[in-house]
Interface confidence: medium
Amino acid sequence: FKVATLYSLYVCPEGQNVTLTCRVFGPVDKGHDVTFYKTWYRSSRGEVQTCSERRPIRNLTFQDLHLHHGGHQAANTSHDLAQRHGLESASDHHGNFSITMRNLTLLDSGLYCCLVVEIRHHHSEHRVHGAMELQVQTGKDAPSSCVAYPSSSQESENITAA
């Protein structure tokens, strides 16, 4: 399986909400011996490998923000901890999983990584990640709502988190 980032860059005004999204695609084993662990963290663009370093998002670690389930099941963080920090991660039946960040500030700007670990009990763990940039802007040059730039082309799309 692979992870695709629908958008490689999100540009948002301060105070807005944004939902960063990744999608798991390719063959997904739905056997009872296979589970998926999905999470989010901040990182930096390393010289060797992007998303290698794991930094917290608003003081919450990747462990705090994880989802854990079998196959393409729906799940979401119900952690009070995450919600108190204006964060919520979620996963749907179609392989999409996301993190919603509320009331963005300039400090939220940076590189965000989604991580998926496929756990085949007794055999192996296979992990893949996706990366995307979030730019939070303020002042007259800031957009009125979030603009997302697709990974594959330069056409932008206006998005607003619910």
Epitope: T35, F62, Q63, I119, H121
Partner: antibody, heavy 118, light 106 residues
Framework: EVQLQQSGPELVKPGASMKISCKAS????????MNWVKQSHGKNLEWIGL????????SYNQKFKGKATLTVDKSSSTAYMELLSLTSEDSAVYYC???????????WGQGTSVTVSS | QIVLTQSPAIMSASPGEKVTMTCSAS?????MFWYQQKPGSSPRLLIY???NLASGVPLRFSGSGSGTSYSLTISRMEAEDAATYYC?????????FGSGTKLEIK
Amino acid sequence: EVQLQQSGPELVKPGASMKISCKASGFSFTGYTMNWVKQSHGKNLEWIGLISPYNGGTSYNQKFKGKATLTVDKSSSTAYMELLSLTSEDSAVYYCARRAYGYAMDYWGQGTSVTVSS
Amino acid sequence: QIVLTQSPAIMSASPGEKVTMTCSASSSVSYMFWYQQKPGSSPRLLIYDTSNLASGVPLRFSGSGSGTSYSLTISRMEAEDAATYYCQQWSSYPFTFGSGTKLEIK
């Protein structure tokens, strides 16, 4: 604060069985695997196996199959390792450690010393 | 199973000296992890995913490598770094540790 509190030292007779506990606190128990590691003579570390409190799934090092049995009690956030048919070779310090998937064992218990002697 | 061979088994260094130890895997692994253990204490995570410092680890520690060859470096040895260091792989079951490198202070 993340803590893994293991049960105290044990002196057991050859052929007996025993159970070590590891009580977790300060984190979401089901978001991690609980791993067990053996350290003999203060030297080599050996991974015994893991259990996922999320679904009870276990994975064992083949070397320890039949020797160790891993269980969890989600209600008390406690992991257990039962050691069976003990011999002098099983004398060691045993550690529990939490591990997030795709990561490392970032918190360890203080260790439980097991001495097998008649 | 993947066998991890650490060298040297024992080494000593003076304060301020640069220290490098290696970990060789019998077959290729995706990432290496390093732990530090002092006598009477539990192992402590130092480095994850080959080159990233775990929380609270001093910047004088660094890790590098790929495939079957990995290393841990301490840029300037300090007395508190005297310990045994273990490498570990999570790439395939059973997860294995190296035999350790004991680092002593001169």
